[in-house]
């Protein structure tokens, strides 16, 4: 038999595919069209090989499929005849990370494609401002991330290293808190969290504005602008105004860019519609009373950024009120 003269062997090709936890992915594999197609997708760890999906004699064969892949894999059966042996993989978990080999045999050749699957997760982080007794803290928090991210802090655009890191989740995904004590500081701070696998970066920026001194019954304008350096025009974001009182935050107003809806929780609170159209979310608080003294926090957040602006308002008694006493 002279078939071997027509037979070609193609060495193993390797591709890296990056997927997201809980999402679906396609592991690519193609071959030169031929008859008698046999496809075997296998997962290889340090000790063993596991059957992921097989196709031969014209149909999918799942008798020996490892249970962890049950109802999670399929081939593009209509495209096999066109040389497509790609595997559709549903609901990725971190345990799916690793090396997958796709063996394809036809009447004229056998090929083995190697796909390295890496799985990442990056739930949108948050920057929080907290007061504990007389201390002030900035917390950069990411609830679910994998692999371990790179977290950097800057003070007035200068990198700093002193921060307290807390991590949970021994194998991943990880939940990470990075806390910075900013008591008594008037500097601006920036925290960046980078997931190098997913090539995703999030930045939180905190700015303390100069204190505002106002008289009772007056109104105050609290500035908060969306900086174009941070936000692209079509990016969804939300704006939250809140007040910090005895370490507890209470929401005053809320704006969602996707729906353009604004909700006010304080009737004396408003913003200028013209300014809002120019991405300026400065607020007016009217008819000030002594109890309005405190810290006001503007939070503008998107998937990639959080901008926190703090205003300290001091409301002093008016002359009339003072002379009445």
């Amino acid at each position: 038999i002279f078939l071997s003269a027509f037979f070609t062997y193609v060495p193993m090709n390797e591709q890296i595919i990056i997927g997201r936890l809980g999402e679906d992915i396609i592991l690519p594999s193609s071959f030169e069209r031929g008859s008698e197609v046999v496809i075997h997708w296998k997962y290889q760890d340090s000790y063993n090989s596991y059957n992921v999906h097989s196709y031969y004699k014209g149909s999918g064969r799942l008798e020996s499929q490892d249970t962890r892949y049950a109802n999670r894999t399929s081939l593009f059966y209509n495209e096999i005849q066109n040389g497509n042996a790609s595997l559709f993989f549903r609901r990725l978990s971190l345990l799916d990370e690793g090396i997958y080999t796709c063996y394809v045999g036809t009447a004229i050749q056998a090929i083995t494609n190697k796909v390295v699957l890496k799985v990442g997760v990056f739930l949108t982080p948050m920057m929080k401002y907290e007061k504990r007794n007389t201390n002030s803290f900035l917390i950069c928090n990411v609830l679910s991330v994998y692999p371990r991210p790179i977290i950097t802090w800057k003070m007035d655009n200068t990198p700093i290293s002193e921060n307290n890191m807390q991590e949970t989740g021994s194998l991943g995904p990880f939940s990470i808190n990075s806390t910075l004590n900013i008591t008594g500081s008037n500097s601006s701070y920036e925290c960046t969290i980078e997931n190098s696998l997913l090539k995703q970066t999030w930045t939180g920026r905190w700015t303390m504005k100069d204190g505002l001194h106002k008289m009772q019954s007056e109104h105050v304008s609290l500035s908060c602008e969306l900086v174009n350096d941070y936000f692209s025009p079509n990016q969804d974001f939300k704006v939250t105004w809140s007040r910090m009182e005895s370490g507890i935050s209470s929401i005053l107003a809320y704006y969602l860019s996707s729906s353009q809806n604004t909700t006010f929780y304080e009737s004396r609170f408003s913003w200028n519609k013209e300014l809002k159209n120019q991405s300026d979310f400065s607020m007016n608080l009217t008819d000030l009373s002594l109890s309005d003294s405190g810290e006001y926090l503007c939070n503008i957040s998107s998937d990639e950024y959080t901008l926190l602006t703090i205003h300290t308002v001091h409301v002093e008694p008016s002359q009339e009120t003072a002379s009445d006493n």
Epitope: I1, S4, K42, S49, S54, Y56, R61, S64, Y103
Partner: antibody, heavy 121, light 106 residues
Framework: QVQLVESGGGVVQPGRSLRLSCAAS????????MHWVRQAPGKGLEWVAI????????YYADSVKGRFTISRDNSKNTLYLQMNSLRAEDTAVYYC??????????????WGQGTLVTVSS | DIQMTQSPSTLSASVGDRVTITCRAS??????LAWYQQKPGKAPKLLIY???SLESGVPSRFSGSGSGTEFTLTISSLQPDDFATYYC????????FGQGTKLEIK
């Protein structure tokens, strides 16, 4: 071109063991399923066992199940058949044959020339 | 287990004849059937796979047909080199051979 060369045959007493080898060349051994097929003198062909390309699956004919073990060493391009508790009815020429593919198809595209095993007291 | 029955067991024919060998499966095997030719003292040689696909390098006078349980191997015009024993093999479930058909010179 594809070459399969069997060795290890000979005369053995009933109840004893024998190991057959098949040296493969001319193709990428680790890409193909391999079979053992036997033929008793003057009789027809009988399929004995198959091992898939990566050794993940092994199947046997009922007549040899529990007594014969098929294995392969892909680094040495060699197929093996360990035959234990041999019986007179195991006397045959043993062929090593290459599957068309991974072993999933189950027919024989290339054959060796065979090695004779005689079980006799 | 699937049984394969070949007929006839022996077939006498002359050079130039058209001959047909039949193979019957005890249950449906779809098209998963192969035909082999074996000469005395030699290893078998693959002729046909998937009931009707001609193996590369095999002369076109050999053809196969059938599906399910009934299959045939046809040699359209016998050549001197074709006198040998022919075996069918099902590979739907593991593997089973027919008992063989010896094609001899009349």
């Amino acid at each position: 071109q594809v070459q399969l060369v069997e060795s290890g045959g000979g005369v053995v007493q009933p109840g004893r063991s024998l190991r057959l080898s098949c040296a493969a060349s001319g193709f990428t051994f680790s890409d193909y399923g391999m079979h053992w097929v036997r033929q008793a003198p003057g009789k027809g062909l009988e399929w004995v066992a198959i091992i898939w390309y990566d050794g993940s699956n092994k199947y046997y004919a009922d007549s040899v199940k529990g007594r014969f073990t098929i294995s392969r060493d892909n680094s040495k391009n060699t197929l093996y058949l360990q035959m234990n508790s041999l019986r007179a009815e195991d006397t045959a020429v043993y062929y090593c044959a290459r599957d068309r593919s991974s072993g999933a198809l189950g027919y024989f595209q290339h054959w060796g020339q065979g090695t004779l095993v005689t079980v006799s007291s | 287990d699937i049984q394969m029955t070949q007929s006839p067991s022996t077939l006498s024919a002359s050079v130039g004849d058209r001959v047909t060998i039949t193979c019957r499966a005890s249950q449906s095997i779809s098209s998963w059937l192969a035909w082999y030719q074996q000469k005395p003292g030699k290893a078998p040689k693959l002729l046909i796979y998937k009931a009707s696909s001609l193996e590369s390098g095999v002369p076109s006078r050999f053809s196969g047909s059938g599906s399910g349980t009934e299959f045939t191997l046809t040699i359209s015009s016998l050549q001197p080199d074709d006198f040998a024993t022919y075996y069918c093999q099902q590979y739907n479930s593991y593997s089973t051979f027919g008992q063989g058909t010896k094609l001899e010179i009349k």
